[in-house]
C-alpha cells in the first residue's frame, strides 16, 4: 500500500480508458458507510466521482455529480440528489454517509451538511466490489462511458464502514481524518490504468 498524503490522482483528459482501481478486501456487506474525498474539476457536465459495483450489480454505490451544485448518491440502483450553492470551478471536500437501518443518506460539502435524504432502508451494499475513480462502471470493473468520465483531481479519499459523527466529518475536512478501515488515503492499494498521474496536492 502507498501513503498518498499530500498527493492527488490527476485525470488530465476526457477518455473512456483512464481510471484508477481501488482495492479493498471488503468481505461482508455494508450496512453503513462514510466516504470522504477532495475533488477539483472544471467540468460543467455530469460525471462520476466514485463508482462501486459488485458482480452483476451496477450502481451498487455511486457518487455522481449531476451538475454544478447537485450531488447524487446511488445505493443499489436507487438514487437521491442533494443540492448546494457552490462556486464553480472550485475545490471541494465531499463526504457522504448512508445508514441501512434508517435509509438516511447525508452529503457534507466543505464541512457543511446538506439536507438529509432517504433511500434503500434495510438494504445491505454488497461486498467484494470493484471500485473505480475516473470512470462510471456499467459492469463489474468496466464498460465505461466517456460522457460520464471525470477530468480533474481527486485526493484525501477515506471510507469507513460506519456513519461518522459530525465532529469526525469536520476532522476529515480539516485534514485530520480518523483511521479508515475500507479505504485509507494514507495506506491505499490501487492500480492506475491509462493516463492518470500522481501529483502534489496544491489546492487545499
Amino acid at each position: 500500500h502507498t501513503d498518498l498524503s499530500g498527493k492527488v490522482f490527476v485525470f488530465p483528459r476526457e477518455s473512456v480508458t483512464d481510471h484508477v482501481n481501488l482495492i479493498t478486501p471488503l468481505e461482508k456487506p455494508l450496512q453503513n458507510f462514510t466516504l470522504c474525498f477532495r475533488a477539483y474539476s472544471d467540468l460543467s457536465r455530469a460525471y462520476s466521482l466514485f463508482s462501486y459495483n459488485t458482480q452483476g450489480r451496477d450502481n451498487e454505490l455511486l457518487v455522481y455529480k449531476e451538475r454544478v451544485g447537485e450531488y447524487s448518491l446511488y445505493i443499489g440502483r436507487h438514487k437521491v440528489t442533494s443540492k448546494v450553492i457552490e462556486k464553480f470551478p472550485a475545490p471541494v471536500h465531499i463526504c457522504v454517509s448512508w445508514e441501512s437501518s434508517s435509509g438516511i443518506a447525508e452529503f457534507w460539502i466543505n464541512g457543511t451538511p446538506l439536507v438529509k435524504k432517504g433511500l434503500r432502508q434495510g438494504y445491505f451494499v454488497e461486498a467484494q466490489p470493484k471500485i473505480v475513480l475516473g470512470q462510471e462502471q456499467d459492469s463489474y470493473g468496466g464498460k465505461f462511458d466517456r460522457s460520464q468520465s471525470f477530468v480533474g483531481e481527486i485526493g484525501d479519499l477515506y471510507m469507513w464502514d460506519s456513519v461518522l459523527p459530525p465532529e469526525n466529518i469536520l476532522s476529515a475536512y480539516q485534514g485530520t481524518p480518523l483511521p479508515a478501515n475500507i479505504l485509507d488515503w494514507q495506506a491505499l492499494n490501487y492500480e492506475i490504468r491509462g493516463y492518470v498521474i500522481i501529483k502534489p496536492l496544491v489546492w487545499v
Epitope: 500500500h1 502507498t2 501513503d3 460506519s162 483511521p179 478501515n181 485509507d184 495506506a187
Partner: antibody, heavy 119, light 107 residues
C-alpha cells in the same frame, strides 16, 4: 520470511536519550506503516506512534509527541525510534510492529528492545 | 483517548475448557478491534482483527465477536499452548489503545 530485527538492550541515565532500531526484511519496507509500541515491566501495551517509510509521514501519540522522534532509512530498510528526556518510568520493552496490508492492526512484530533508565 | 477495559484481569482454567475474555471500549469503536496473544518474553501475536476475523494461521478454536463498545474473545477448547496474556486493541481513533491484558493461567 517477513522479519523485524531490533537493536539490543540499552541502559540509560535519566535525562538522556535512546535510539532503538528496527531492521525489516522479507517485504517491501517502503510500502508499510511501521509502528512503535512499548510495554513497561509487568504492564500492558502502549502505542507511541508510526511512520510510513516512503512518504516519511508520521503520527504520534500526544503523550509522547514532545519526546519521541520516529524516522526511517529506506536504503537500509530500518526504522528508528528515539526517545529523549528519559525518566525511570520509560523503562520498558520497545517493539516495532508492521501495519497489516489493509487494516490498522499489527501483523508482524520485532522481538523487542529492553531500555532500562536508571541512575 | 479511548479506554479499553478488559475483564477479567486474570483467569485460571483447565485444558479443554471454554474461555471468554471481554473488552469494553469507553466509546463506540465500531468493529475496529483486534486481539493479540503474548507469551512471557515474547512479542504479541495477532489473533483476531476487525472484531471477528481470524488472522491467517490462527487455530479455529479462537473466535471474536462484538461491535460498538463490547467485544469478546472466545477460546472454545483450551490447549496447553494457549496459556498466555491476551490484549484487545482499538484502531478506530488515534491514539490506538490497548486493554490492560488478561492473564490466562493453568488451574
Amino acid at each position: 520470511q517477513v522479519q523485524l530485527v531490533q537493536s539490543g538492550a540499552e541502559v540509560k541515565k535519566p535525562g538522556s536519550s535512546v535510539k532503538v532500531s528496527c531492521k525489516a526484511s522479507g517485504y517491501t519496507f517502503t510500502s508499510y506503516w511501521m509502528h512503535w509500541v512499548r510495554q513497561a515491566p509487568g504492564q500492558g501495551l502502549e502505542w507511541m506512534g508510526m511512520i510510513h517509510p516512503n512518504s516519511v509521514n508520521t503520527n504520534y501519540n500526544e503523550k509522547f509527541k514532545s519526546r519521541v522522534t520516529i524516522t526511517a532509512d529506506k536504503s537500509t530498510s530500518t526504522a528508528y525510534m528515539e526517545l529523549s528526556s528519559l525518566r525511570s518510568e520509560d523503562t520498558a520493552v520497545y517493539y516495532c510492529a508492521r501495519r497489516n496490508d489493509y487494516y490498522w492492526y499489527f501483523d508482524v512484530w520485532g522481538q523487542g528492545t529492553l531500555v532500562t533508565v536508571s541512575s | 483517548d479511548i479506554q479499553m477495559t478488559q475483564s477479567p484481569s486474570s483467569l485460571s482454567a483447565s485444558v479443554g475448557d471454554r474461555v471468554t475474555i471481554t473488552c469494553k471500549a469507553s466509546q463506540n469503536v465500531n468493529s475496529n478491534v483486534a486481539w493479540y496473544q503474548q507469551k512471557p518474553g515474547k512479542a504479541p501475536k495477532l489473533l483476531i482483527y476487525s472484531a471477528s476475523y481470524r488472522y491467517s494461521g490462527v487455530p479455529s478454536r479462537f473466535s471474536g465477536s462484538g461491535s460498538g463498545t463490547d467485544f469478546t474473545l472466545t477460546i472454545s477448547s483450551l490447549q496447553p499452548e494457549d496459556f498466555a496474556t491476551y490484549y484487545c486493541q482499538q484502531c478506530n481513533n488515534y491514539p490506538f489503545t490497548f486493554g490492560q491484558g488478561t492473564k490466562l493461567e493453568i488451574k
